[in-house]
């Protein structure tokens, strides 16, 4: 009871004067506020709330639910109080069976005691199943039992308030906890893809996928740099307790030009936020660009091999693809992939195989792409290097030596003169005459060279050499000359292959 | 024992907006979910979204989405349901329900609050 | 959505009679499934919650059982203060009701 020091108002009286009270069950309560400012009783338990306006609170046959805290307040707003146990062999525990707590917080288990002379107040599992190791609790016979430091593992656990009376265990009706979680991490935030590509009117849809421990995590699409409030559907679901997911899909149902732009899932909840974006691009049209992975000038030698590739871009996808040599379409020889199996790739390879080209093969190769919107090509100038091949070698009518010889690059016809039985024939003769006989045909063939040397120059016998060659290689033809008198005649000319 | 007490019945208009009220009489409010179910006149039960005002996130159910705002005053233990641009096919009984979010079952229920659109 | 189908919609039973009303879902739902008891004018009352689980103050008369997606509600023997609609839900995605079903008096 309350100590009154004069001069200031000082809190009520309460009859009987004590701290707590035990009254059986039946019996009358009589508690009398003795102030002369009284304003009213407060009846408390398990959060319910009665009022009594008369100085006298009377029950004249009480309850197990009569039990609780009764507090008398005068004018003044002081206040004095008296705990009353109603004692009820059939009722010892008041229970309020709603139970909640959050992770790593106290809660408490709402069972006070109508007899606070029972002993081993505490809690028990349900049919018998032992308590987690590490439950924790503090018992308290006007409040009930609190749970310390609530765990994520405690979630629907079933228990009973327990005690003692009169030598046998009596039981609670059960309480399941129900435990929020904490959040300890931020969302975990994926989109279904990274960027998109569209035409105009094209449908935009892209979901961003929200993984956390409660269904309350925020979470919500943004437009950079706008704040349009953008319309999105959700879908959700619990794979468990503590392991929520949401799908959150944003859609544009006929895209524009000026739509593009870089979209943001944005989600947070109490302990930090996570983001993720996509980037939309939408053209006014499809479109193909080509980009070549070799030179389009392509030289390769004789007999060799060489393969010719690009790569392009494609929106939308390509639908026909070929290559195309002197208007005829390659059937085989050629490849076509795409360049990623990643869903959003544009990008694509074309390769062509030309093996053991001929010199009759060189030219113009054509890679010829198109989709729904647009088509595209892009040529290929192949030049078959071939060694020289002598064509013709003569004596002329007119006592003129003539070679002619064909290759690419185009060849040098060199003369050499031989005296006697030389082998090697070392002194150079200069041409009279040299002509490219081919040079506005075909631009892909082989060039023709002619050059001619006087044959009478040669005043002794012996081995005239016409050599060709070009970067490739080099071919020889010899003509023989022997003097009979005054009269040189040609012996049959014969050619050597000087690789 | 906790109860759930709802505000009275009301009739509107159609294209206005209600706010119905639920209070929450003790308990550890601000960690319950509280839920908003309604139940057009003879038809079956409808759950519309609820909110933990421990959290202040709302979810709702995708055919509502847009129309009703959910919040709780954690002050006043209490919880709000704000449905807009009603029409004559929201007359129902709306109940507010501890419960039905993160896999919890509507364990307690408050009575119903009767909204009538008419014009 | 997860759609919910309840079956019977209606049935007619006498006092003492083992009813039997299934609900199944259109997709797992693991076990978390809950029954509700509603009688005309009141709101809904909670019985089986986790599909099998007897909520505290409901008659043992009344369990569940099923997991996945098919699910039963059982009333032992039929009391008269039974005869009421009741209502499956499931709490995986967005919460869904069965439509009902109704038990009448034979």
């Known amino acids: 009871q309350p100590s009154v020091s004069p001069g200031e108002p000082s809190p009520p009286s309460i009859h009987p004067a004590k701290s707590e009270l035990i009254v059986r069950v039946g019996n009358e309560i009589r508690l009398l506020c003795i102030d002369p400012g009284f304003v009213k009783w407060t009846f408390e338990i398990l959060d319910e709330t009665n009022e009594n306006k008369q100085n006298e609170w009377i029950t004249e046959k009480a309850e197990a639910t009569n039990t609780g805290k009764y507090t008398c307040t005068n004018k003044h707003g002081l206040s004095s109080s008296i705990y009353v146990f109603v004692r009820d062999p059939a009722k010892l525990f008041l229970v309020d069976r709603s139970l909640y707590g959050k992770e790593d917080n106290d809660t408490l288990v709402r069972c006070p005691l109508t007899d606070p002379e029972v002993t081993s107040y505490s809690l028990k599992g349900c049919q018998g199943k032992p308590l987690p190791k590490d439950l924790r609790f503090v018992p308290d016979p006007k409040a009930g039992i609190t749970i310390k430091s609530v765990k994520r593992a405690y979630h629907r656990l079933c228990l009973h308030c327990s005690a003692d009376q009169e030598g046998k265990s009596v039981l609670s009706d059960k309480f399941i906890l129900k435990v929020r979680p904490a959040f300890k991490a931020v969302p975990v935030v994926s989109v279904s893809k990274a960027s998109y590509l569209l035409r105009e009117g094209e449908e935009f849809t892209v979901t961003c996928t929200i993984k956390d421990v409660s269904s309350s995590v925020y979470s919500t699409w943004k437009r950079e740099n706008s704040q349009t409030k953008l319309q999105e559907k959700y879908n959700s679901w619990h794979h468990g307790d503590f392991n929520y997911e949401r799908q959150a899909t944003l859609t544009i149902s006929s895209a524009r030009v000026n739509d593009s732009g870089v979209f943001m899932c944005y989600a947070n909840n109490t302990f930090g936020s996570a983001n993720v974006t996509t980037t939309l691009e939408v053209v006014d049209k499809g479109f193909i660009n080509i980009f070549p992975m070799i030179n389009t000038t392509v030289f390769v030698n004789d007999g060799e091999n060489v393969d010719l590739i690009v790569e392009y871009e494609a929106f939308p996808k390509p639908e026909h693809q070929q290559w195309i040599y002197m208007n005829r379409t390659f059937t085989d020889k050629w490849e076509d992939y795409p360049k990623s199996e990643n869903e959003s790739n544009i990008r694509y390879v074309s390769e062509l195989h030309l093996t053991r080209l001929k010199g009759t093969e060189g030219g113009t190769y054509t890679f010829l792409v198109s989709n729904s919107d647009v088509n595209a090509s892009i040529a290929f100038n192949v030049y078959v290097n071939t060694k020289p091949e002598i064509l013709t070698y003569d004596r002329l009518v007119n006592g003129m030596l003539q070679c002619v010889a064909a290759g690419f690059p185009e060849p040098t016809i060199d003369w050499y003169f031989c005296p006697g039985t030389e082998q090697r024939c070392s002194a150079s003769v200069l041409p009279v005459d040299v002509q490219t006989l081919n040079a506005s045909g075909p631009p892909f063939g082989k060039l023709v060279v002619q050059s001619s040397i006087d044959s009478s120059a040669f005043k002794h016998n012996g081995t005239v050499e016409c050599k060709a060659y070009n970067d490739v290689g080099k071919t020889s033809a010899y003509f023989n000359f022997a003097f009979k008198g005054n009269n040189k005649e040609q012996i049959h000319p014969h050619t050597l292959f000087t690789p | 024992q906790v109860q759930l007490v709802q505000s009275g019945a009301e009739v509107k208009k159609p294209g206005s907006s209600v706010k119905v009220s639920c209070k929450a009489s003790?308990?550890?409010?601000?960690?319950?979910?509280i839920s908003w179910v309604r139940q057009a006149p003879g038809q079956g039960l409808e759950w519309m979204g609820g909110?933990?005002?421990?959290?202040?996130?709302?979810n709702y159910a995708q055919k509502f989405q847009g129309r009703v705002t959910i919040t709780a005053d954690e002050s006043t233990s209490t919880a709000y349901m704000e449905l807009s641009s009603l029409r004559s096919e929201d007359t129902a009984v709306y109940y507010c329900?501890?419960?039905?979010?993160?896999?919890?079952?509507?364990?307690?229920w408050g009575r119903g609050t009767l909204v009538t659109v008419s014009s | 959505d997860i759609q919910m189908t309840q079956s019977p919609s209606s049935l007619s039973a006498s006092v003492g009679d083992r009813v039997t009303i299934t609900c199944r879902a259109s997709?797992?739902?693991?076990?978390?499934l809950n029954w509700y008891q509603q009688k005309p004018g009141k709101a809904p009352k909670l019985l089986i919650y986790?599909?099998?689980s007897l909520q505290s103050g409901v008659p043992s008369r009344f369990s569940g059982s099923g997991s996945g997606t098919d699910f039963t509600l059982t009333i032992s023997s039929l009391q008269p203060e039974d005869f009421a609609t009741y209502y499956c839900?499931?709490?995986?995605?967005?919460?869904?009701f069965g439509g009902g079903t109704k038990v009448e008096i034979k």
């Open positions: 986790a599909a099998s």
């Open positions: 329900a501890r419960g039905g979010l993160d896999t919890d079952e509507f364990d307690l």
């Open positions: 909110i933990i005002p421990d959290f202040g996130v709302a």
């Open positions: 003790g308990g550890t409010f601000r960690i319950y979910a």
């Open positions: 997709q797992s739902i693991n076990s978390y």
């Open positions: 839900q499931q709490g995986v995605s967005d919460i869904t």
